[in-house]
Protein backbone atom coordinates (compact mmCIF):
# COMPACT_ATOMS: atom_id res chain seq x y z
CA UNK A 1 0.00 0.00 0.00
CA UNK A 2 1.31 3.43 -0.98
CA UNK A 3 1.51 6.07 1.79
CA UNK A 4 1.02 9.76 0.99
CA UNK A 5 1.45 12.58 3.53
CA UNK A 6 -0.59 15.76 3.24
CA UNK A 7 -0.76 19.13 4.98
CA UNK A 8 -3.92 20.49 6.58
CA UNK A 9 -5.42 23.18 4.32
CA UNK A 10 -3.26 22.10 1.38
CA UNK A 11 -4.01 20.12 -1.78
CA UNK A 12 -2.93 16.54 -2.45
CA UNK A 13 -2.98 14.52 -5.67
CA UNK A 14 -3.43 10.76 -5.33
CA UNK A 15 -2.37 8.95 -8.49
CA UNK A 16 -3.80 5.81 -10.01
CA UNK A 17 -2.48 4.35 -13.25
CA UNK A 18 -4.02 1.83 -15.62
CA UNK A 19 -1.73 -0.53 -17.50
CA UNK A 20 -2.97 0.73 -20.85
CA UNK A 21 -2.78 4.33 -22.05
CA UNK A 22 -6.47 4.76 -22.72
CA UNK A 23 -9.58 6.24 -21.21
CA UNK A 24 -11.41 3.60 -19.18
CA UNK A 25 -13.85 3.27 -16.28
CA UNK A 26 -12.45 4.19 -12.87
CA UNK A 27 -13.73 4.97 -9.38
CA UNK A 28 -12.19 6.38 -6.22
CA UNK A 29 -13.72 5.14 -2.96
CA UNK A 30 -12.90 5.57 0.71
CA UNK A 31 -12.27 2.72 3.18
CA UNK A 32 -16.02 2.45 3.80
CA UNK A 33 -16.51 1.75 0.08
CA UNK A 34 -18.33 5.07 -0.40
CA UNK A 35 -17.77 6.46 -3.91
CA UNK A 36 -16.00 9.82 -4.08
CA UNK A 37 -15.58 10.30 -7.81
CA UNK A 38 -15.39 8.38 -11.05
CA UNK A 39 -16.19 8.40 -14.73
CA UNK A 40 -19.57 8.16 -16.35
CA UNK A 41 -19.49 8.17 -20.12
CA UNK A 42 -16.82 10.76 -20.82
CA UNK A 43 -17.40 12.92 -17.78
CA UNK A 44 -16.44 13.12 -14.14
CA UNK A 45 -19.15 12.17 -11.65
CA UNK A 46 -19.16 12.55 -7.89
CA UNK A 47 -20.49 10.18 -5.24
CA UNK A 48 -22.16 10.76 -1.85
CA UNK A 49 -18.90 11.02 0.10
CA UNK A 50 -18.43 14.11 2.32
CA UNK A 51 -15.18 14.61 0.43
CA UNK A 52 -16.83 14.95 -2.97
CA UNK A 53 -17.15 18.74 -3.00
CA UNK A 54 -13.39 19.02 -2.41
CA UNK A 55 -12.37 16.27 -4.84
CA UNK A 56 -11.40 16.67 -8.50
CA UNK A 57 -9.49 14.89 -11.25
CA UNK A 58 -7.43 15.76 -14.32
CA UNK A 59 -9.47 14.72 -17.36
CA UNK A 60 -6.60 15.72 -19.64
CA UNK A 61 -4.65 12.68 -18.40
CA UNK A 62 -7.40 10.07 -18.57
CA UNK A 63 -6.49 9.00 -22.08
CA UNK A 64 -2.94 8.47 -20.79
CA UNK A 65 -4.32 5.90 -18.33
CA UNK A 66 -3.77 8.26 -15.39
CA UNK A 67 -6.79 8.68 -13.10
CA UNK A 68 -5.74 10.99 -10.29
CA UNK A 69 -7.87 12.24 -7.43
CA UNK A 70 -7.13 15.73 -6.20
CA UNK A 71 -8.34 16.61 -2.69
CA UNK A 72 -8.17 20.30 -1.81
CA UNK A 73 -8.38 22.10 1.54
CA UNK A 74 -7.24 18.94 3.37
CA UNK A 75 -8.57 18.17 6.84
CA UNK A 76 -7.03 15.85 9.45
CA UNK A 77 -10.16 13.69 9.18
CA UNK A 78 -9.46 13.13 5.45
CA UNK A 79 -6.77 10.71 6.63
CA UNK A 80 -7.98 7.37 5.31
CA UNK A 81 -7.21 4.55 2.90
CA UNK A 82 -8.49 5.45 -0.55
CA UNK A 83 -9.16 2.82 -3.18
CA UNK A 84 -8.86 3.37 -6.91
CA UNK A 85 -10.74 0.76 -8.94
CA UNK A 86 -9.56 0.53 -12.56
CA UNK A 87 -9.26 -2.37 -15.05
CA UNK A 88 -10.64 -4.88 -12.53
CA UNK A 89 -7.84 -4.07 -10.10
CA UNK A 90 -7.70 -2.09 -6.89
CA UNK A 91 -4.95 0.32 -5.92
CA UNK A 92 -4.84 1.41 -2.28
CA UNK A 93 -3.37 4.70 -1.13
CA UNK A 94 -3.12 5.61 2.55
CA UNK A 95 -3.42 9.34 3.06
CA UNK A 96 -2.18 10.82 6.35
CA UNK A 97 -2.93 14.51 6.91
CA UNK A 98 -0.92 16.53 9.44
CA UNK A 99 -1.21 20.06 10.74
CA UNK A 100 1.43 22.08 12.58
CA UNK A 101 0.48 25.26 14.38
CA UNK A 102 1.95 27.65 16.91
CA UNK A 103 0.04 27.52 20.22
CA UNK A 104 0.15 31.26 20.71
CA UNK A 105 0.55 34.32 18.56
CA UNK A 106 3.54 33.98 16.22
CA UNK A 107 4.69 37.48 17.29
CA UNK A 108 6.57 36.84 20.53
CA UNK A 109 8.80 38.89 22.78
CA UNK A 110 12.44 38.00 23.15
CA UNK A 111 12.77 35.53 26.03
CA UNK A 112 9.26 34.17 25.67
CA UNK A 113 8.65 30.53 24.78
CA UNK A 114 7.31 29.13 21.54
CA UNK A 115 5.27 25.91 21.40
CA UNK A 116 4.41 24.18 18.15
CA UNK A 117 1.68 21.53 18.22
CA UNK A 118 1.28 18.76 15.70
CA UNK A 119 -2.21 17.63 14.73
CA UNK A 120 -2.11 14.08 13.45
CA UNK A 121 -4.52 11.28 12.54
CA UNK A 122 -5.33 8.64 15.15
CA UNK A 123 -2.95 5.68 15.09
CA UNK A 124 -0.06 7.62 13.51
CA UNK A 125 3.28 8.00 15.29
CA UNK A 126 5.05 10.88 13.58
CA UNK A 127 8.31 12.55 14.55
CA UNK A 128 8.96 16.27 14.08
CA UNK A 129 12.23 18.08 13.49
CA UNK A 130 12.33 21.87 13.29
CA UNK A 131 15.14 24.13 12.13
CA UNK A 132 15.25 27.78 13.16
CA UNK A 133 16.37 30.54 10.75
CA UNK A 134 19.66 30.58 12.66
CA UNK A 135 20.20 26.85 12.10
CA UNK A 136 19.16 25.60 15.55
CA UNK A 137 17.64 22.07 15.40
CA UNK A 138 14.86 20.98 17.75
CA UNK A 139 13.18 17.58 17.78
CA UNK A 140 9.94 16.41 19.31
CA UNK A 141 6.75 14.43 19.02
CA UNK A 142 3.28 15.96 19.29
CA UNK A 143 4.72 19.21 20.66
CA UNK A 144 7.93 21.11 20.16
CA UNK A 145 9.01 23.76 22.65
CA UNK A 146 11.57 26.52 22.35
CA UNK A 147 11.90 27.80 25.93
CA UNK A 148 13.59 31.17 25.37
CA UNK A 149 13.35 32.88 22.01
CA UNK A 150 16.30 34.96 20.85
CA UNK A 151 16.23 37.71 18.24
CA UNK A 152 18.02 35.40 15.75
CA UNK A 153 15.02 33.03 15.98
CA UNK A 154 13.00 35.55 13.96
CA UNK A 155 12.08 34.34 10.48
CA UNK A 156 10.85 31.17 8.82
CA UNK A 157 11.06 27.95 10.81
CA UNK A 158 11.13 24.80 8.68
CA UNK A 159 9.59 21.76 10.32
CA UNK A 160 9.70 18.27 8.84
CA UNK A 161 7.12 15.70 9.89
CA UNK A 162 8.15 12.09 9.25
CA UNK A 163 5.94 9.01 9.16
CA UNK A 164 6.53 5.64 7.46
CA UNK A 165 9.74 6.92 5.84
CA UNK A 166 7.79 9.74 4.16
CA UNK A 167 8.12 13.41 5.02
CA UNK A 168 6.06 16.57 4.75
CA UNK A 169 7.47 20.06 5.31
CA UNK A 170 5.82 22.94 7.15
CA UNK A 171 7.00 26.54 7.17
CA UNK A 172 6.04 28.76 10.09
CA UNK A 173 6.90 32.46 10.24
CA UNK A 174 7.94 33.60 13.70
CA UNK A 175 8.52 37.25 14.59
CA UNK A 176 10.64 37.88 17.67
CA UNK A 177 9.79 41.30 19.02
CA UNK A 178 13.08 42.89 20.07
CA UNK A 179 15.39 45.80 19.47
CA UNK A 180 18.10 45.22 16.87
CA UNK A 181 20.80 45.50 19.53
CA UNK A 182 20.75 44.43 23.15
CA UNK A 183 23.19 47.17 24.06
CA UNK A 184 24.97 50.10 22.46
CA UNK A 185 27.52 52.66 23.61
CA UNK A 186 27.84 56.26 22.44
CA UNK A 187 31.22 58.00 22.89
CA UNK A 188 31.18 61.81 22.93
CA UNK A 189 33.38 64.77 23.75
CA UNK A 190 32.05 67.14 26.37
CA UNK A 191 29.62 69.62 24.84
CA UNK A 192 28.79 67.58 21.75
CA UNK A 193 25.22 66.69 20.83
CA UNK A 194 24.33 63.06 21.55
CA UNK A 195 22.10 60.93 19.32
CA UNK A 196 20.62 57.70 20.70
CA UNK A 197 18.88 55.38 18.24
CA UNK A 198 16.79 52.32 19.11
CA UNK A 199 15.94 50.47 15.86
CA UNK A 200 13.50 47.58 16.10
CA UNK A 201 14.36 44.16 14.71
CA UNK A 202 10.85 43.69 13.25
CA UNK A 203 8.12 45.50 11.37
CA UNK A 204 4.43 45.43 12.19
CA UNK A 205 1.50 46.98 10.31
CA UNK A 206 0.27 48.69 13.46
CA UNK A 207 2.67 49.40 16.26
CA UNK A 208 1.17 50.80 19.44
CA UNK A 209 2.55 50.93 22.96
CA UNK A 210 4.40 53.05 25.49
CA UNK A 211 7.98 53.38 26.59
CA UNK A 212 10.39 54.95 29.06
CA UNK A 213 14.10 55.66 29.34
CA UNK A 214 15.54 55.21 32.83
CA UNK A 215 19.01 56.63 33.38
CA UNK A 216 21.66 55.78 35.93
CA UNK A 217 24.29 58.51 35.85
CA UNK A 218 27.71 57.40 37.07
CA UNK A 219 27.82 60.28 39.52
CA UNK A 220 24.26 59.78 40.80
CA UNK A 221 23.22 57.51 43.65
CA UNK A 222 19.96 56.42 42.03
CA UNK A 223 18.45 56.12 38.58
CA UNK A 224 15.81 58.47 37.25
CA UNK A 225 13.30 58.51 34.43
CA UNK A 226 14.51 60.79 31.67
CA UNK A 227 11.56 60.49 29.31
CA UNK A 228 8.26 58.65 28.85
CA UNK A 229 6.48 58.38 25.51
CA UNK A 230 3.60 56.80 23.65
CA UNK A 231 3.66 55.00 20.33
CA UNK A 232 0.49 55.00 18.24
CA UNK A 233 0.49 53.50 14.75
CA UNK A 234 4.26 54.10 14.50
CA UNK A 235 3.86 57.77 15.57
CA UNK A 236 5.81 58.82 18.67
CA UNK A 237 4.53 61.37 21.19
CA UNK A 238 6.36 62.46 24.33
CA UNK A 239 4.38 62.27 27.56
CA UNK A 240 6.89 63.50 30.12
CA UNK A 241 10.51 64.64 29.98
CA UNK A 242 12.91 65.77 32.72
CA UNK A 243 14.04 69.39 32.82
CA UNK A 244 17.69 68.35 33.13
CA UNK A 245 18.64 67.01 30.69
CA UNK A 246 15.96 68.17 28.28
CA UNK A 247 15.83 65.31 25.81
CA UNK A 248 14.20 65.61 22.41
CA UNK A 249 12.52 62.70 20.69
CA UNK A 250 11.83 61.99 17.01
CA UNK A 251 8.20 61.66 15.96
CA UNK A 252 8.76 58.62 13.71
CA UNK A 253 10.38 55.21 14.01
CA UNK A 254 13.10 54.20 14.65
CA UNK A 255 12.94 55.57 18.20
CA UNK A 256 15.42 58.43 18.31
CA UNK A 257 16.54 60.58 21.24
CA UNK A 258 18.73 63.67 21.21
CA UNK A 259 20.65 64.97 24.21
CA UNK A 260 21.64 68.59 23.47
CA UNK A 261 25.03 68.34 25.22
CA UNK A 262 27.24 65.55 26.46
CA UNK A 263 28.24 66.50 30.01
CA UNK A 264 30.13 64.47 32.65
CA UNK A 265 27.07 64.47 34.91
CA UNK A 266 25.04 62.67 32.21
CA UNK A 267 27.60 59.91 31.59
CA UNK A 268 26.24 56.54 32.60
CA UNK A 269 23.90 53.90 31.35
CA UNK A 270 20.23 53.81 30.52
CA UNK A 271 17.57 51.24 29.87
CA UNK A 272 14.91 51.93 27.28
CA UNK A 273 11.80 49.80 27.73
CA UNK A 274 8.93 49.48 25.29
CA UNK A 275 5.64 47.84 26.21
CA UNK A 276 3.60 46.86 23.16
CA UNK A 277 -0.19 46.83 23.15
CA UNK A 278 -1.70 43.34 23.60
CA UNK A 279 1.70 41.86 24.52
CA UNK A 280 2.78 40.78 27.96
CA UNK A 281 6.31 41.80 28.83
CA UNK A 282 8.57 44.55 27.54
CA UNK A 283 11.30 45.08 24.99
CA UNK A 284 14.61 46.33 26.41
CA UNK A 285 17.69 48.02 25.07
CA UNK A 286 20.61 49.17 27.16
CA UNK A 287 22.43 52.33 26.11
CA UNK A 288 25.67 53.72 27.52
CA UNK A 289 27.10 57.20 27.31
CA UNK A 290 30.84 57.83 27.70
CA UNK A 291 31.94 61.48 27.92
CA UNK A 292 35.51 62.77 27.47
CA UNK A 293 36.99 66.03 28.74
CA UNK A 294 40.50 67.36 28.12
CA UNK A 295 41.60 70.34 30.27
CA UNK A 296 44.72 72.33 31.04
CA UNK A 297 44.99 73.87 34.49
CA UNK A 298 48.21 75.62 35.38
CA UNK A 299 51.03 73.12 34.72
CA UNK A 300 48.72 70.13 34.48
CA UNK A 301 47.20 68.68 31.25
CA UNK A 302 44.41 66.22 32.12
CA UNK A 303 42.22 63.92 30.11
CA UNK A 304 39.26 62.23 31.77
CA UNK A 305 36.40 59.96 30.74
CA UNK A 306 33.15 59.32 32.56
CA UNK A 307 30.68 56.55 32.03
CA UNK A 308 30.81 52.76 31.66
CA UNK A 309 34.18 51.82 30.14
CA UNK A 310 35.72 48.37 30.15
CA UNK A 311 39.00 47.93 32.10
CA UNK A 312 40.83 46.98 28.88
CA UNK A 313 40.25 50.40 27.30
CA UNK A 314 43.32 52.64 27.07
CA UNK A 315 43.34 56.36 27.66
CA UNK A 316 46.30 58.23 26.14
CA UNK A 317 47.67 61.74 25.91
CA UNK A 318 49.86 62.25 22.86
CA UNK A 319 51.62 65.28 21.46
CA UNK A 320 50.94 65.62 17.77
CA UNK A 321 53.95 64.81 15.50
CA UNK A 322 56.04 63.95 18.53
CA UNK A 323 56.72 60.72 20.35
CA UNK A 324 55.66 62.02 23.74
CA UNK A 325 52.82 59.81 24.99
CA UNK A 326 51.34 58.81 28.29
CA UNK A 327 48.92 55.84 28.35
CA UNK A 328 46.95 54.16 31.09
CA UNK A 329 44.17 51.62 31.46
CA UNK A 330 42.40 54.13 33.64
CA UNK A 331 39.72 56.80 33.50
CA UNK A 332 42.14 59.71 33.77
CA UNK A 333 45.62 60.52 32.46
CA UNK A 334 47.70 63.64 32.90
CA UNK A 335 50.97 65.27 31.95
CA UNK A 336 52.78 67.75 34.20
CA UNK A 337 54.38 70.69 32.47
CA UNK A 338 53.28 69.64 28.98
CA UNK A 339 55.24 70.79 25.93
CA UNK A 340 53.56 73.37 23.78
CA UNK A 341 51.62 72.06 20.80
CA UNK A 342 48.47 70.20 19.86
CA UNK A 343 47.78 67.34 22.25
CA UNK A 344 45.43 64.50 21.51
CA UNK A 345 43.47 62.61 24.11
CA UNK A 346 42.54 59.15 22.79
CA UNK A 347 40.26 56.48 24.18
CA UNK A 348 41.02 53.23 22.39
CA UNK A 349 40.17 49.57 22.38
CA UNK A 350 42.97 47.29 21.07
CA UNK A 351 44.31 50.07 18.86
CA UNK A 352 40.92 51.18 17.57
CA UNK A 353 40.17 54.79 18.52
CA UNK A 354 36.71 55.17 20.07
CA UNK A 355 36.94 58.82 21.06
CA UNK A 356 39.41 61.64 20.66
CA UNK A 357 39.67 65.20 21.86
CA UNK A 358 42.28 67.79 20.88
CA UNK A 359 43.62 70.48 23.18
CA UNK A 360 46.16 73.17 22.33
CA UNK A 361 48.87 73.87 24.89
CA UNK A 362 50.35 77.34 24.47
CA UNK A 363 53.94 78.04 25.57
CA UNK A 364 54.35 79.80 28.91
CA UNK A 365 57.08 82.44 28.91
Amino acid sequence: KKVVLGKKGDTVELTCNASQKKNTQFHWKNSNQIKILGIQGLFLTKGPSKLSDRADSRKSLWDQGCFSMIIKNLKIEDSDTYICEVENKKEEVELLVFGLTANSDTHLLEGQSLTLTLESPPGSSPSVKCRSPGGKNIQGGRTISVPQLERQDSGTWTCTVSQDQKTVEFKIDIVVLAFQKASSTVYKKEGEQVEFSFPLAFTLEKLTGSGELWWQAERASSSKSWITFDLKNKEVSVKRVTQDPKLQMGKKLPLHLTLPQALPQYAGSGNLTLALEAKTGKLHQEVNLVVMRATQFQENLTCEVWGPTSPKLTLSLKLENKGATVSKQAKAVWVLNPEAGMWQCLLSDSGQVLLESNIKVVPTW
Epitope: L42, L44, K46, D56, S57, K59, S60, L61, Q64
Partner: antibody, heavy 119, light 107 residues
Amino acid sequence: EVQLLESGGGLVQPGGSLRLSCAASGFSFSNYAMSWVRQAPGKGLEWVASINEWGSTFYADSVKSRFTISRDNSKNTLYLEMNSLRAEDTAVFYCSRHYGGSYDPMDYWGQGTTVTVSS
Amino acid sequence: DIQMTQSPSSLSASVGDRVTITCRASQDINKYIAWYQQKPGKGPKLLIHYTSILHPGVPSRFSGSGSGTDYTLTISSLQPEDFATYYCLQYDNPLQTFGQGTKLEIK
Protein backbone atom coordinates in the same frame (compact mmCIF):
# COMPACT_ATOMS: atom_id res chain seq x y z
CA GLU B 1 -17.10 21.55 -33.59
CA VAL B 2 -16.30 23.51 -30.40
CA GLN B 3 -17.22 27.19 -30.74
CA LEU B 4 -16.90 30.02 -28.22
CA LEU B 5 -18.25 33.46 -29.05
CA GLU B 6 -17.57 36.41 -26.74
CA SER B 7 -19.67 39.59 -26.62
CA GLY B 8 -20.32 42.58 -24.38
CA GLY B 9 -17.00 44.43 -24.77
CA GLY B 10 -16.84 48.16 -25.33
CA LEU B 11 -15.72 51.53 -24.00
CA VAL B 12 -16.34 52.23 -20.32
CA GLN B 13 -15.21 54.97 -17.93
CA PRO B 14 -12.90 54.21 -14.97
CA GLY B 15 -15.01 53.01 -12.04
CA GLY B 16 -17.69 51.74 -14.40
CA SER B 17 -19.09 48.26 -14.97
CA LEU B 18 -19.43 45.85 -17.87
CA ARG B 19 -20.78 42.33 -18.36
CA LEU B 20 -19.15 39.98 -20.84
CA SER B 21 -20.89 36.90 -22.22
CA CYS B 22 -19.58 33.81 -23.96
CA ALA B 23 -21.95 31.60 -25.95
CA ALA B 24 -20.68 28.02 -26.17
CA SER B 25 -21.66 25.34 -28.67
CA GLY B 26 -20.42 22.02 -30.04
CA PHE B 27 -19.84 20.35 -26.66
CA SER B 28 -21.58 19.42 -23.40
CA PHE B 29 -21.11 22.82 -21.73
CA SER B 30 -22.12 21.80 -18.18
CA ASN B 31 -19.40 19.13 -18.01
CA TYR B 32 -16.46 21.49 -18.53
CA ALA B 33 -14.68 24.13 -16.50
CA MET B 34 -14.51 27.51 -18.24
CA SER B 35 -12.18 30.50 -17.91
CA TRP B 36 -11.68 34.11 -18.88
CA VAL B 37 -8.19 35.13 -20.00
CA ARG B 38 -7.21 38.66 -20.99
CA GLN B 39 -4.50 40.28 -23.07
CA ALA B 40 -3.63 43.96 -22.65
CA PRO B 41 -2.57 45.76 -25.87
CA GLY B 42 0.88 44.50 -26.93
CA LYS B 43 1.19 42.36 -23.81
CA GLY B 44 1.00 38.68 -22.85
CA LEU B 45 -1.85 36.47 -21.70
CA GLU B 46 -3.20 36.78 -18.15
CA TRP B 47 -5.58 34.25 -16.61
CA VAL B 48 -8.46 36.15 -14.96
CA ALA B 49 -11.01 33.71 -13.54
CA SER B 50 -12.32 30.14 -13.77
CA ILE B 51 -15.51 28.30 -12.90
CA ASN B 52 -15.55 24.52 -12.73
CA GLU B 53 -18.30 22.03 -13.62
CA TRP B 54 -19.65 22.18 -10.06
CA GLY B 55 -19.75 25.99 -9.87
CA SER B 56 -16.61 26.58 -7.78
CA THR B 57 -14.88 29.82 -8.76
CA PHE B 58 -11.24 30.93 -8.83
CA TYR B 59 -9.86 34.45 -9.39
CA ALA B 60 -6.54 36.14 -10.10
CA ASP B 61 -5.50 38.50 -7.25
CA SER B 62 -5.68 41.49 -9.63
CA VAL B 63 -9.46 41.11 -10.11
CA LYS B 64 -10.58 39.48 -6.85
CA SER B 65 -13.65 41.22 -5.35
CA ARG B 66 -14.12 43.34 -8.50
CA PHE B 67 -14.95 40.64 -11.09
CA THR B 68 -17.47 37.79 -10.83
CA ILE B 69 -17.50 34.73 -13.07
CA SER B 70 -20.73 32.77 -13.47
CA ARG B 71 -22.37 30.30 -15.82
CA ASP B 72 -25.87 29.43 -16.99
CA ASN B 73 -25.77 25.80 -18.08
CA SER B 74 -29.32 25.97 -19.44
CA LYS B 75 -28.20 28.70 -21.89
CA ASN B 76 -24.68 27.29 -22.50
CA THR B 77 -23.34 30.70 -21.56
CA LEU B 78 -20.40 31.92 -19.47
CA TYR B 79 -20.40 35.42 -17.93
CA LEU B 80 -17.91 37.88 -16.47
CA GLU B 81 -19.34 40.73 -14.41
CA MET B 82 -16.72 43.50 -14.12
CA ASN B 83 -17.06 46.31 -11.57
CA SER B 84 -14.80 49.19 -10.46
CA LEU B 85 -13.00 49.04 -13.79
CA ARG B 86 -9.54 50.60 -14.06
CA ALA B 87 -7.43 51.77 -17.02
CA GLU B 88 -5.21 48.69 -16.53
CA ASP B 89 -8.22 46.42 -17.23
CA THR B 90 -8.12 47.53 -20.88
CA ALA B 91 -7.61 44.31 -22.84
CA VAL B 92 -8.99 41.72 -25.22
CA PHE B 93 -10.94 39.22 -23.08
CA TYR B 94 -10.96 35.62 -24.26
CA CYS B 95 -13.39 32.93 -23.16
CA SER B 96 -11.80 29.48 -22.98
CA ARG B 97 -12.84 25.91 -22.27
CA HIS B 98 -10.80 23.60 -20.10
CA TYR B 99 -9.94 20.07 -21.18
CA GLY B 100 -12.11 18.94 -18.28
CA GLY B 101 -11.98 20.52 -14.84
CA SER B 102 -10.16 23.51 -13.39
CA TYR B 103 -7.03 21.37 -12.85
CA ASP B 104 -6.78 20.87 -16.63
CA PRO B 105 -5.33 23.25 -19.21
CA MET B 106 -7.53 25.26 -21.57
CA ASP B 107 -7.96 23.55 -24.93
CA TYR B 108 -10.33 25.82 -26.93
CA TRP B 109 -10.52 29.60 -27.11
CA GLY B 110 -12.82 32.22 -28.59
CA GLN B 111 -11.72 35.13 -30.78
CA GLY B 112 -12.01 37.65 -27.94
CA THR B 113 -13.95 40.82 -27.14
CA THR B 114 -12.26 44.17 -26.55
CA VAL B 115 -12.75 46.15 -23.32
CA THR B 116 -11.45 49.73 -23.20
CA VAL B 117 -11.43 51.60 -19.90
CA SER B 118 -10.84 55.29 -20.50
CA SER B 119 -12.27 58.68 -19.56
CA ASP C 1 1.12 32.17 -6.63
CA ILE C 2 3.40 30.38 -9.06
CA GLN C 3 5.42 32.64 -11.38
CA MET C 4 6.48 31.50 -14.84
CA THR C 5 9.60 33.02 -16.39
CA GLN C 6 9.79 32.48 -20.13
CA SER C 7 12.84 33.06 -22.31
CA PRO C 8 13.79 34.43 -24.72
CA SER C 9 11.19 37.17 -25.08
CA SER C 10 11.84 37.28 -28.82
CA LEU C 11 13.69 35.09 -31.27
CA SER C 12 14.67 35.41 -34.94
CA ALA C 13 15.02 32.22 -36.94
CA SER C 14 14.79 30.86 -40.45
CA VAL C 15 12.60 28.20 -42.03
CA GLY C 16 14.12 24.80 -41.29
CA ASP C 17 15.83 25.95 -38.06
CA ARG C 18 15.52 24.09 -34.77
CA VAL C 19 14.17 26.39 -32.08
CA THR C 20 13.94 25.99 -28.28
CA ILE C 21 11.87 28.10 -25.87
CA THR C 22 12.20 27.65 -22.10
CA CYS C 23 9.98 28.28 -19.11
CA ARG C 24 11.05 28.25 -15.48
CA ALA C 25 8.51 27.94 -12.68
CA SER C 26 9.00 29.55 -9.24
CA GLN C 27 8.30 26.11 -7.69
CA ASP C 28 7.89 22.50 -8.76
CA ILE C 29 4.84 22.25 -11.06
CA ASN C 30 4.91 18.45 -11.35
CA LYS C 31 5.01 18.49 -15.19
CA TYR C 32 1.69 20.36 -15.36
CA ILE C 33 2.72 22.73 -18.14
CA ALA C 34 0.99 23.49 -21.44
CA TRP C 35 2.27 25.37 -24.49
CA TYR C 36 0.17 27.65 -26.71
CA GLN C 37 0.66 29.32 -30.08
CA GLN C 38 -0.97 32.68 -30.80
CA LYS C 39 -1.14 34.56 -34.08
CA PRO C 40 -2.07 38.28 -34.32
CA GLY C 41 -5.78 38.96 -33.82
CA LYS C 42 -6.55 35.34 -32.94
CA GLY C 43 -7.14 33.35 -29.79
CA PRO C 44 -4.35 31.01 -28.60
CA LYS C 45 -4.16 27.37 -29.76
CA LEU C 46 -3.13 24.50 -27.48
CA LEU C 47 -0.03 22.66 -28.73
CA ILE C 48 1.14 20.51 -25.81
CA HIS C 49 -0.08 19.60 -22.33
CA TYR C 50 1.41 17.68 -19.41
CA THR C 51 4.92 18.69 -20.58
CA SER C 52 5.07 16.49 -23.68
CA ILE C 53 1.61 15.30 -24.81
CA LEU C 54 0.75 16.66 -28.25
CA HIS C 55 -2.78 18.01 -28.64
CA PRO C 56 -4.65 16.27 -31.51
CA GLY C 57 -3.88 17.83 -34.88
CA VAL C 58 -0.58 19.41 -33.79
CA PRO C 59 2.36 18.54 -36.08
CA SER C 60 5.03 16.20 -34.66
CA ARG C 61 7.78 18.81 -35.20
CA PHE C 62 6.54 20.32 -31.91
CA SER C 63 7.79 18.60 -28.76
CA GLY C 64 8.05 19.37 -25.08
CA SER C 65 10.24 18.20 -22.22
CA GLY C 66 11.21 19.02 -18.64
CA SER C 67 10.42 18.32 -15.02
CA GLY C 68 10.48 20.07 -11.66
CA THR C 69 10.78 23.77 -12.45
CA ASP C 70 12.44 23.76 -15.91
CA TYR C 71 10.59 23.09 -19.17
CA THR C 72 11.23 23.48 -22.89
CA LEU C 73 9.26 23.65 -26.12
CA THR C 74 11.18 22.59 -29.23
CA ILE C 75 10.26 23.08 -32.87
CA SER C 76 12.54 20.68 -34.77
CA SER C 77 12.27 22.26 -38.22
CA LEU C 78 10.55 25.65 -38.50
CA GLN C 79 7.80 26.02 -41.08
CA PRO C 80 6.48 29.38 -42.39
CA GLU C 81 3.20 28.94 -40.43
CA ASP C 82 5.14 28.57 -37.13
CA PHE C 83 6.06 32.26 -36.92
CA ALA C 84 3.89 33.42 -34.01
CA THR C 85 4.01 34.11 -30.26
CA TYR C 86 4.33 31.14 -27.90
CA TYR C 87 3.21 30.98 -24.27
CA CYS C 88 3.72 28.45 -21.50
CA LEU C 89 1.02 27.89 -18.88
CA GLN C 90 1.31 26.16 -15.50
CA TYR C 91 -1.83 24.38 -14.36
CA ASP C 92 -0.50 22.64 -11.25
CA ASN C 93 -3.37 24.37 -9.45
CA PRO C 94 -6.51 26.22 -10.61
CA LEU C 95 -4.79 29.62 -10.21
CA GLN C 96 -3.13 29.17 -13.57
CA THR C 97 -0.30 31.41 -14.74
CA PHE C 98 1.26 32.14 -18.12
CA GLY C 99 4.82 32.92 -19.09
CA GLN C 100 5.46 36.37 -20.62
CA GLY C 101 5.55 34.96 -24.15
CA THR C 102 8.18 34.43 -26.87
CA LYS C 103 7.74 36.17 -30.20
CA LEU C 104 9.20 34.02 -32.97
CA GLU C 105 10.08 36.13 -36.01
CA ILE C 106 11.51 35.42 -39.45
CA LYS C 107 15.22 36.21 -39.73
